[in-house]
């Protein structure tokens, strides 16, 4: 019908009328080129180069990871994107100053077992939740 | 012991260290001020201003939400920080350049009930999940 | 071997603006940060800013934030620093530095001098 | 920020002599991130020491670091001529990066 071609249209006008010339904004980035789409970045983090190697015994280290990259419109299956940064993605566009974009942060967060002196010097064997990232998206 | 004050002083170490001097960074907010912290900003969004007009029949709009501020050392509290975040802060910065800050992210979302036309001109019910933004916190 | 090649000496006149070069070579360019530093006479060296190359994100001293630019060319393996507003008290020796992840700065340009005079 | 300040500020000895540069901070930070610079006239500083007591790449085992805490130790052991330059110590963990103001070791 007549309202359902209206209706598809306006959809696709939502999306179409998104697809626009990236506007360089004065950001960290240099705004000539842009920053990938959020993901996992390796990283592995020593507990000597945080200061803590007198009170950690084991792990010297682990691979922590991060998440880092754009949450740009428009979100594609790979960036984990809730509803709600699929809304605000669409919101940043039409209102830039106001909204920002989602940010790429862990979906997926993994523990470690860390060995370490207590205060009063024993030796503890404790479980550390959400250390690991192990998968990141567009929140 | 000798050995219980220099872990505690190593756990001091890593705190105060960071007690450095803030520094603007060429960021989209204007750094000659300190951007607050993480938190959760209102946010109403109307589906006409999406462009969804004529696809959504009810509601007209609701109260999306969205999180945005600074997920700066030290982490406290109301900033919900996960494990890793508090790690990365401080792998930050010591090495920003690298890192970035953890991120300003939503930590609880709640569903909104949706009445909408789909693609062959049906009125649908359906509960979205994930697109009101309840609280926020630094992943 | 890792190299940092900076470009040559600059005479400029106080409030005009002074662009330098830095030439890496002999390694990844694009996993580094580089570090732009300067040294005046007498005094002790004073950090401006760095550059991530493979992301462009980038940080400035708040000392130089409204003067100074930090640019890189991926393709050409090439940092920039641009100071604008030259006064008298920039006239220094400018380097730029790399600097690994947790690590010191590694390397080092051998500096260029810019002396600003009226 | 991390004011580091160095002492003597110049130290004038023979060569086979054994120099001993301070630098001290004025806050504790983790030694991972103490380095120490060596710089001629006219030249680029080259990175002798890192990590407060790591020497750097095809740097002679004369020069040795030591330290931790607020207080940092540069020694080089038996002068070589080429050894007379300023030696600058760096705080590289995190933004500001700062620097000594210079030791100039000369030839008394």
């Known amino acids: 019908s007549a309202s359902s071609r209206r209706r598809q249209q306006s959809r696709n006008r939502s999306t179409q009328s998104q697809d626009v010339a990236r506007v360089s904004s004065a950001s960290d980035y240099n705004s000539s080129e842009l920053k990938t789409a959020c993901r996992k970045h390796e990283l592995y983090v020593s507990f000597q180069d945080l200061g803590w190697q007198d009170w950690i015994i084991a792990p010297k280290g682990y691979a922590a990871n991060y998440c880092d990259g754009e949450c740009s419109f428009p979100l594609n299956a790979h960036m984990n994107a809730t509803n709600h940064a699929i809304v605000q993605t669409l919101v940043h566009l039409m209102n830039p100053e106001y909204v920002p974009k989602p940010c790429c942060a862990p979906t997926k967060l993994n523990a470690i077992s860390v060995l370490y002196f207590d205060d009063n010097s024993n030796v503890i064997l404790k479980k550390y939740r959400n250390m690991v990232v192990r998968a990141c998206g567009c929140h | 012991s000798a050995s219980s004050r220099r872990r505690q002083q190593s756990r001091n170490r890593s705190t105060q260290s960071q007690d450095v001097a803030r520094v603007s960074s060429a960021s989209d907010y204007n750094s000659s001020e300190l951007k607050t912290a993480c938190r959760k900003h209102e946010l109403y969004v109307s589906f006409q201003d999406l462009g969804w007009q004529d696809w959504i029949i009810a509601p007209k709009g609701y109260a999306a939400n969205y999180c945005d501020g600074e997920c700066s050392f030290p982490l406290n509290a109301h900033m919900n920080a996960t494990n890793h975040a508090i790690v990365q802060t401080l792998v930050h910065l010591m090495n920003p350049e690298y890192v970035p800050k953890p991120c300003c992210a939503p930590t609880k979302l709640n569903a909104i009930s949706v009445l909408y036309f789909d693609d062959n001109s049906n009125v649908i019910l359906k509960k979205y999940r994930n697109m009101v933004v309840r609280a926020c916190g630094c992943h | 071997q890792v190299q940092l090649v900076q470009s040559g000496a600059e005479v400029k006149k106080p409030g005009a603006s002074v662009k330098v070069s830095c030439k890496a070579t002999g390694f990844t360019f694009i996993t580094y940060a580089f570090h732009w530093v300067r040294q005046a006479p007498g005094q002790r060296f004073e950090w401006m800013g760095w550059i991530n190359v493979g992301n462009g994100n980038r940080e400035y001293s708040q000392k130089f934030q409204d003067r100074v630019t930090i640019t890189r060319d991926t393709s050409a393996t090439t940092v920039y620093m641009e100071l604008n507003s030259l006064k008298s008290e920039d006239t220094a020796m400018y380097f730029c530095?790399?600097?690994?992840?947790?690590?010191?700065?590694?390397?080092w340009g051998q500096g260029t001098l810019v002396t600003v005079s009226s | 920020e991390i004011v580091l300040t160095q002492s003597p500020g110049t130290l004038s000895l023979s060569p086979g002599e054994r120099a001993t540069l301070s630098c001290r901070a004025s806050q504790i930070f983790s030694n991972t991130f103490l380095a120490w610079y060596q710089q001629k006239p006219g030249q680029a500083p080259r990175l002798l020491v890192y990590g407060a007591s790591k020497r750097a790449t095809a740097i002679p085992d004369r020069f040795s670091g030591s330290g931790s805490g607020t207080d940092f130790i540069l020694t080089i052991n038996r002068l070589e001529p080429e050894d007379f330059a300023v030696y600058y110590c760096q705080h590289y963990g995190g933004s500001p990066w700062t620097f000594g103001r210079g030791t100039k070791v000369e030839i008394k």
């Open positions: 530095a790399r600097r690994p992840l947790w690590g010191p700065f590694d390397y």
